[in-house]
């Protein structure tokens, strides 16, 4: 059994999250994950999910009664999602920590926008994707 | 030339982001993107970058002088990053909009944690990753 399972059960007790009523009004993450089978699509979604949990754990980092559970779960997330790669985890955390209201950050983000956009689609590297039209209406 | 280029130049003027001093103290996104060549790693990082830009654009949605530029860039992001797939974009936005301080959201997130963790690594599907030992002693 993976290390996180016992600790996640401990968190369920702490958050009173074991009751069946918790599942009312649908899921947060599971339904969305079910929609996406392709690895790159899953990573787009899981990236947001992992950053949510990291933020949640940060909010409870001073709570001694669940500290060990939180640390163990974070550790196992690092193993599973970042493949224990500290550089990957650090780059990810840098991105999640940028403040969208900081004027210098805003200027840098706009300064880099054209290059970021140029790299967004796999087509930027492989040239495989055919773009017939630019018609997004959403 | 992609539609976003002209509009991004317009945003550069608006944010005063064309000056060379903007590049001082390194990049926000470009240096990180340079580190990651594998598609799934890139998606992990780009997911955070795109959500940053969406938040940034949301903060300026009422500014008439850049509204057209922002809309055009968002539209092109949807084409490039979400492959014009509205369901993908909608699922992504749901994830970015969950409030980490909402008690019901917290309970749901903890309720789903074990299943989310089980799906985090590609190994969950492919069985490729070798885990030498699982030696958990609580």
């Amino acid at each position: 059994q993976d290390p996180y399972v016992k600790e996640a059960e401990n968190l369920k007790k702490y958050f009173n999250a074991g009751h069946s009523d918790v599942a009312d009004n649908g899921t947060l993450f599971l339904g969305i994950l079910k929609n996406w089978k392709e690895e790159s699509d899953r990573k787009i979604m899981q990236s947001q999910i992992v950053s949510f949990y990291f933020k949640l754990f940060k909010n409870f980092k001073d709570d001694q009664s669940i500290q060990k559970s939180v640390e163990t779960i974070k550790e196992d997330m690092n193993v599973k999602f970042f493949n224990s790669n500290k550089k990957k985890r650090d780059d990810f955390e840098k991105l999640t920590n940028y403040s969208v209201t900081d004027l210098n950050v805003q200027r840098k983000a706009i300064h880099e926008l054209i290059q970021v956009m140029a790299e967004l689609s796999p087509a930027a590297k492989t040239g495989k994707r055919k773009r017939s039209q630019m018609l997004f209406r959403g | 030339q992609d539609p976003y280029v002209k509009e991004a130049e317009n945003l550069k003027k608006y944010f005063n982001a064309g000056h060379s001093d903007v590049a001082d103290n390194g990049t926000l996104f470009l240096g990180i993107l340079k580190n990651w060549k594998e598609e799934s790693d890139r998606k992990i990082m780009q997911s955070q970058i795109v959500s940053f830009y969406f938040k940034l654009f949301k903060n300026f949605k009422d500014d008439q002088s850049i509204q057209k530029s922002v809309e055009t860039i968002k539209e092109d992001m949807n084409v490039k990053f979400f492959n014009s797939n509205k369901k993908k974009r909608d699922d992504f936005e749901k994830l970015t909009n969950y409030s980490v301080t909402d008690l019901n959201v917290q309970r749901k997130a903890i309720h789903e944690l074990i299943q989310v963790m089980a799906e985090l690594s590609p190994a969950a599907k492919t069985g490729k990753r070798k885990r030498s030992q699982m030696l958990f002693r609580g």
Epitope: P3, D76, N78, V79, N83, N85, K86 | N35, K37, R137
Partner: antibody, heavy 120, light 112 residues
């Protein structure tokens, strides 16, 4: 100040067993991955094994897989390496090293090492 | 498997600058941090560079680290060489695919 003190080395016959210990102090032991690295006489550094901070997941070099077992007791701030079926090529100084909170970070502090000699 | 290759030995005069290379094969060197360790004869290794280019406190700024993605290599540069810099230097990284810590073979630096 971080301190790592290895013990348990010595002379052992081929096929025999030995258990190394590493007593740690000066940092939050349970928050850091810990590793064993060895160095045969006159040779370079060779990674042996790493264990996550909780003790939940262990990784081994191919050369010791199935023969060596890494473990830790976080209440005693101690890391262990159980070595079985020892071979002459396992002869080396064994270093205990403190990692970062992720297995894939560096090894930022090292003990002075304990010598293991496998010989008949 | 990911491997790191270093020159077996290098020598340089005091006061000069030396660069020790560490070339990756079987994967990209830029996707995991690179560390550099100094080992003087009869002593345990100590870290001189961690996380590609960061110097631990107490390590002089004569030591610097860099990564070059295009040549898939890392470098340790020591300027203003001093006699006490004579030692073995090892680069180290991580193979995420099989969770192995990887060391280079080591470079014996002689200060003439």
């Amino acid at each position: 100040e971080v301190q790592l003190l290895e013990s348990g080395g010595g002379l052992v016959q081929p096929g025999g067993s030995l258990k190394l210990s590493c007593a740690a102090s000066g940092f939050t032991f349970s928050s850091n991955a810990m590793s064993w690295v060895r160095q045969a006489p006159g040779k370079g550094l060779e990674w042996v094994s790493t264990l996550t901070g909780s003790g939940g997941t262990a990784y081994y070099a191919d050369s010791v897989e199935g023969r060596f077992s890494i473990s830790r007791d976080n209440s005693k701030n101690t890391l262990y390496l159980q070595m079985n079926s020892l071979r002459a090529e396992d002869t080396a100084v064994y270093y205990c090293a403190k990692g970062t909170e992720l297995v894939g970070g560096g090894l930022d502090n090292w003990g002075q090492g304990t010598l293991v000699t496998v010989s008949s | 498997n990911f491997m790191l290759t270093q020159p077996h030995s290098l020598s340089e005069s005091p006061g000069k600058t030396v660069t020790i290379s560490c070339t990756g094969s079987g994967g990209s060197i830029a996707t995991n941090y690179v560390q550099w360790y100094q080992q003087r004869p009869g002593s345990a290794p100590t870290t001189v560079i961690h996380e590609d280019n960061q110097r631990p406190s107490g390590v002089p700024d004569r030591f610097s680290g860099s990564i070059d993605g295009s040549s898939n290599s890392a470098s340790l540069t020591i300027s203003g060489l001093q006699p006490e810099d004579e030692a073995d230097y090892y680069c180290q990284s991580y193979d995420s695919d099989n969770h192995h810590v990887v060391f280079g073979g080591g470079t014996k630096l002689t200060v003439l």
